[in-house]
Amino acid sequence: VPGEEKQPVPTPDLVEAEVGSTALLKCGPSRASGNFSQVDWFLIHKERQILIFRVHQGKGQREPGEYEHRLSLQDSVATLALSHVTPHDERMFLCKSKRPRLQDHYVELQVFKAPEEPTIQANVVGIHVDRQELREVATCVGRNGYPIPQVLWYKNSLPLQEEENRVHIQSSQIVESSGLYTLKSVLSARLVKEDKDAQFYCELSYRLPSGNHMKESKEVT
């Protein structure tokens, strides 16, 4: 209706799943009981609702499209199982139950994947103390994580932080076709005589449904 305000989306249920696993999307809070005999599942895409699955009289029916081969009913007719989760599945889903009563329920799927062990490469050959400049010390690469992991740099086991005119950390990421991220972080620093034998390494910190985790690279001198 022209001039009509958009209704805010009710707070969705959050479902977390690792890449490759099966995500269970429940039509309503787990404590909700009742005979959900008729449910329609939608994918919310650019404010449009795209029908992806129907439940009618306890039977599931896949709709043609990108999800048709990965959706099935799980135990209860109120739970939709999405198999082989990928980062592209990190979306908002909506189930509309028509019986026992008319209601909308939103489910937000969050996807996670641990990055591979970070690789590190030293960029500096020798320390030049006459240079009043930032020098590239090392490059750290963490492949195939989701979402983008955080990178931390360490010098002699002490965390290094961005510091004006002394330490600069430039991180960039590329999205692989799989939707996973490869993170590249370049550490630049002013090097002094005392850094001759310093050990540098990077650490990726990331989250999974099971909690927070981290992976460390090897050390470089």
């Epitope: 500096v124 050959v125 020798g126 030049h128 006459d130 240079r131 009043q132 400049e133 930032l134 020098r135 510091e163 004006e164 005119n165 002394r166 600069h168 630049s188 002013r190």
Partner: antibody, heavy 120, light 114 residues
Framework: EVRLVESGGGLVQPGKSMKLSCVAS????????MSWVRQAPAKGLEWVAS????????FCRDLVKGRFTISRDNAKSTLYLQMDSLRPEDTATYYC?????????????WGQGTSVTVSS | DIVMTQSPSSLAVSAGETVSIHCKSS????????????LAWFQQKPGQSPKLLIF???TRQSGVPDRFIGRGSGTDFTLTISGVQAEDLAIYYC??????????FGAGTKLELK
């Protein structure tokens, strides 16, 4: 905004001393190497001295070695140039400059200068 | 010390012209450790302090118009100003900061109107 403000210049007799100051603001002074550069009237630029961020390393051009001393007080964000045994050829505008490490140590910010005249 | 030889010492131009200023160093300013040339160009307008235009021989400082172009490597460098404007009238200095214990400047090139 990065600002460098020099002061302390003026007229001084040959053989006397003078101390120049440069107050920095708008950046973390204690993280930067700093330099003094001078320019004699109608002449070119001449590097005078540099100092490391912590103040432990100082470098001076040969012509002023033993007469000029560069120092800094990081707590006050101030750079100094102590000039002793001044000569007429030290007459110049003295600029302080910041050295940007991300640019290889180039002088990326300059003060407006303070004029020193050595004359009897 | 590294000696910087700048030419010409002065240059008379008309607005809109393209001019080049040359700078030669007595030794290479290309540092093998970083593969960068430690050469800068400064602009100094009458009564003002020098202003950094170019560092690492060809990298424009933030806010510098793209009509200022730095080129060169090793010992030979050029600053080109394409389409000179009245506000570009100034003295231009090259400077080596390869040897950071003894920075040296060229003698300067005065850019004036014909």
């Amino acid at each position: 905004e990065v600002r460098l403000v020099e002061s302390g210049g003026g007229l001084v007799q040959p053989g006397k001393s003078m101390k120049l100051s440069c107050v920095a603001s708008g950046f973390k002074f204690s993280n930067y190497y700093m330099s003094w550069v001078r320019q004699a009237p109608a002449k070119g630029l001449e590097w005078v001295a540099s100092i490391s961020d912590g103040g432990g390393d100082t470098f001076c051009r040969d012509l002023v070695k033993g007469r000029f001393t560069i120092s800094r007080d990081n707590a006050k964000s101030t750079l100094y140039l102590q000039m002793d045994s001044l000569r007429p050829e030290d007459t110049a505008t003295y600029y302080c400059a910041r050295r940007g490490a991300a640019m290889g140590g180039v002088m990326d910010a300059w003060g407006q200068g303070t004029s020193v005249t050595v004359s009897s | 010390d590294i000696v910087m030889t700048q030419s010409p010492s002065s240059l008379a131009v008309s607005a809109g012209e393209t001019v080049s200023i040359h700078c030669k160093s007595s030794q290479s300013l290309l540092y093998s450790g970083t593969q960068k040339n430690y050469l800068a160009w400064f602009q100094q307008k009458p009564g003002q302090s020098p202003k950094l235009l170019i560092f690492w021989a060809s990298t424009r400082q933030s806010g510098v118009p793209d009509r200022f172009i730095g080129r060169g490597s090793g010992t030979d460098f050029t600053l080109t100003i394409s389409g000179v404007q009245a506000e570009d009238l100034a003295i231009y200095y090259c400077q080596q900061y390869y040897d950071t214990l003894t920075d040296t400047f060229g003698a300067g090139t005065k850019l004036e109107l014909k």
